[in-house]
């Protein structure tokens, strides 16, 4: 069964800057990745970035840089300033779509006890939805 993992890290140098990393553990071909905050994609969350494997990347503030790390993982740097700045308990969600086979989504937030710049290695997060 495919799984999605999400890792959220606060940067030590800029405490309002977050890095979100997401990955897909499965054999399917990814057709689109959507990163949102405030809840799952399609369930009240706000889209921060959309990454298509061939057609490019779209992102919206406060997203600063979204990129593919591998064919099945992405990273997104958020630059926080003012009202749109993320806070420590913000939930970030990643949805990996494989059209028309299905989509898989998981969410994560900054670990409560994490120091800036320190984070546990990514582990598979529970699947919230599989269409």
């Amino acid at each position: 069964t495919p799984e999605v993992w999400v890792q959220v890290r606060m940067e030590a140098t800029e405490l309002s800057s977050f890095t979100i990393r997401c990955g897909f553990l499965g054999s399917g071909s990814i057709s689109l990745v959507t990163v949102s905050w405030g809840g799952p994609n399609g369930a009240g969350g706000t889209t921060l970035a959309v990454l298509h494997p061939e057609r490019g990347i779209r992102q919206w503030a406060p997203a600063r840089q979204a990129r593919w790390e591998t064919q099945s993982s992405i990273s997104l740097i958020l630059e926080g300033s003012g009202a749109s700045s993320p806070c420590a308990n913000t939930t970030f969600c990643c949805k990996f779509a494989s059209f028309p086979e299905g989509s898989w989504e998981a969410c994560g937030s900054l670990p409560p006890s994490s120091d800036p710049g320190l984070s546990a290695p990514p582990t598979p997060a529970p699947i919230l939805r599989a269409d």
Epitope: S31, L32, T34, S36, N41, G42, A43, G45, T46, T47, V50, H52, R55, G56, R58, W60, K95, A97, F99, P100, S103, D131
Partner: nanobody, 120 residues
């Protein structure tokens, strides 16, 4: 959660017409296109038509002049009127909501699909 439910597929003779419907519920922020893809038996996926957030319809060359895509915002519905159907239009048709990349509508959510068979 976004849900898309297609209807209207079926068996039709060449030259006939069908109207596909898609009932949408839920919303994903910043999606800016809605449309139809199809997958013929043993073939790859093809974007048939989509409507941008500006309301402009776009069609793949092979259906221009035969297919018409439209929306009813009050009913949260999308339609595909298919006229002068040909055998090569036989496929599973998917309603999609997605994000625009140039002239392409990248599916983020989609329905279960409805089968259209054009045969005499």
């Amino acid at each position: 959660e976004v849900q898309l439910v297609e209807s209207g597929g079926g068996l039709v003779q060449p030259g006939g017409s069908l109207r596909l419907s898609c009932a949408a519920s839920g919303y994903t922020s910043r999606t800016d296109c809605m449309g139809w893809f199809r997958q013929a038996p043993g073939k790859g996926l093809e974007g048939v038509a989509h409507i941008d957030s500006d309301g402009i319809p776009r069609y793949v060359e092979s259906v221009k002049g035969r297919f018409t895509i439209s929306q009813d915002h009050a009913k949260n519905s999308l339609y595909l009127q298919m006229n002068s159907l040909r055998a090569e239009d036989t496929a599973v048709y998917y309603c999609v909501v997605g994000f625009k990349f140039g002239d392409y509508c990248a599916p983020n959510d989609w329905g279960q699909g409805t089968m259209v068979t054009v045969s005499s």
